[in-house]
Amino acid sequence: QRLPRMQEDSPLGGGSSGEDDPLGEEDLPSEEDSPREEDPPGEEDLPGEEDLPGEEDLPEVKPKSEEEGSLKLEDLPTVEAPGDPQEPQNNAHRDKEGDDQSHWRYGGDPPWPRVSPACAGRFQSPVDIRPQLAAFCPALRPLELLGFQLPPLPELRLRNNGHSVQLTLPPGLEMALGPGREYRALQLHLHWGAAGRPGSEHTVEGHRFPAEIHVVHLSTAFARVDEALGRPGGLAVLAAFLEEGPEENSAYEQLLSRLEEIAEEGSETQVPGLDISALLPSDFSRYFQYEGSLTTPPCAQGVIWTVFNQTVMLSAKQLHTLSDTLWGPGDSRLQLNFRATQPLNGRVIEASFPAGVDSSPRAAEPVQLNSCLAAGD
């Protein structure tokens, strides 16, 4: 029987979770890294949200003071790693370079839609989350995780795949987004920036966080990933923002301390099993959810993104280790491995809590509140 994660669970590794109050718009730091010249070509020319102000229209807001504690995310959707939408959902039998969905990179040729046409789809990820426009859905219950606390043996494979650092997860990690919405975890990976430059994939009101973790899951309705790709709800990703805090995060340190061993692109090592849930925020009840895509080729749509409102805290040294240790293709550092945010194109981001109810300066303006689409779930 699955038990929901209890609110009284201890915060991950040494007080690494964010505070319990959601991040209000007035608490958001200003976005300083936009536009990004590193964003993959072929994406920045996509149409933006015509009915929403652009980042340049957002008022600058001052960050929280240190004594107020860590930021919390109110709406963040997360992204995913690549796979192949055809029969072998991976790279098997993809022998022509033009067809090879591993043959892509951040910020360079080939344009992603040429690698996979789905990358030019209308419902892509990541997105910018605007809590004021999120639809509060009381039907969105706390996430349930089972089997995420792994013993040290068997060890797990940690690999620098040239696009991210990826931990392959064993069978048996079960996650439920709600009744009848059950998934099995496959892998987790991270997205990050560079020195002084944030690298989360999702943004909140234009604010980009230092890094982001994605735990990728396959629906139990599908036996194979290639069957699930592109099918609504076939894949689900749990995403959480990582930001700087005063203490070392002991859970993350179990992975970060091994990055030097896999500095080279394509290298791998074995790490003892660990508590995967400790890499996520402790509050499983407050999150944003929307339907999007993988954030890398093949960019398959139908992916359910669940972005935690609470952030995870890592020390400055840990964030530096993450962004400054690994090497990617072409003897270049593996940095800034995030995709540009994509237009919502009419999608509604749902929230499991009343994220849009706040007293921000813009609350005086008329805001069209979106209705919850999941009321019947």
Partner: antibody, heavy 124, light 106 residues
């Protein structure tokens, strides 16, 4: 369709270095997501993984052979090579090169395709 | 190192028989298993990967299952071309193969 072909001497003297090359055709060895591997099979026995190389030059070896093994890659020739030093009769085997496929989405991996194999005999 | 033990080491069967081969890991493996078929004088050919995924072009009479330490390859209805040696392989800790199971004509 990618094909692999092993080449090298079929006879090596004890204490010498065994050298084999695998030529890849029908695809680029520089495509990410693939790990170029060597596997051997002693006569009438099972399969033993030797190690792999990524196009970037990153290698990963079987711990039991690590001290004697070097795998290298020449992307300009679309080839990768195996060197096994200080060989003995116990190294007599059919040596296969194979491509290890890596599914970046799931982390799953497996060997396909394989070369046809080349028999290397260690004898004086 | 993780050891992979296959059983039986050989099996005699007839065309149309259901054949089951098991593979046991010396410790639980966190990644997933692959199965290969090898015929005399030929290179191995992948049948199943990630425990249960059928490789493209492989007949559906082959199936795989299992998790943790115990894995199974099943041939639902043995065909003449299926007489061969079968190997399991794990990629959890480096890469290791089972010792093989020979499927012979009864």
């Amino acid at each position: 369709q990618v094909q692999l072909q092993e080449s090298g001497p079929g006879l090596v003297k004890p204490s010498q270095t065994l050298s084999l090359t695998c030529t890849v055709s029908g695809g680029s060895i520089s495509s990410g997501g693939y790990y170029w591997s060597w596997i051997r099979q002693h006569p009438g026995k099972g399969l033993e993984w030797i190690g792999y190389i990524y196009y970037s030059g990153s290698t990963y070896y079987n711990p039991s052979l690590k001290s004697r093994v070097t795998i290298s890659v020449d992307t300009s020739k679309n080839q990768f090579s195996l060197k096994l030093s200080s060989v003995t009769a116990a190294d007599t085997a059919v040596y296969y090169c194979a491509r290890e496929n890596y599914d970046i989405l799931t982390g799953f991996n497996w060997f396909d395709p394989w070369g046809q194999g080349t028999l290397v005999t260690v004898s004086s | 190192d993780i050891q992979m033990t296959q059983s039986p080491s050989s099996v005699s069967a007839s065309v149309g028989d259901r054949v089951t081969i098991t593979c046991r890991a010396s410790q639980g493996i966190s990644s997933w298993l692959a199965w290969y078929q090898q015929k005399p004088g030929k290179a191995p050919k992948v049948l199943i990967y990630s425990t249960s995924r059928l490789q493209s072009g492989v007949p559906s009479r082959f199936s795989g299952s299992g998790s943790g330490t115990d894995f199974t390859l099943t041939i639902s209805s043995l065909q003449p071309e299926d007489f061969a040696t079968y190997y399991c392989q794990q990629a959890d800790s480096f890469r290791t193969f089972g010792q093989g199971t020979k499927v012979e004509i009864k």
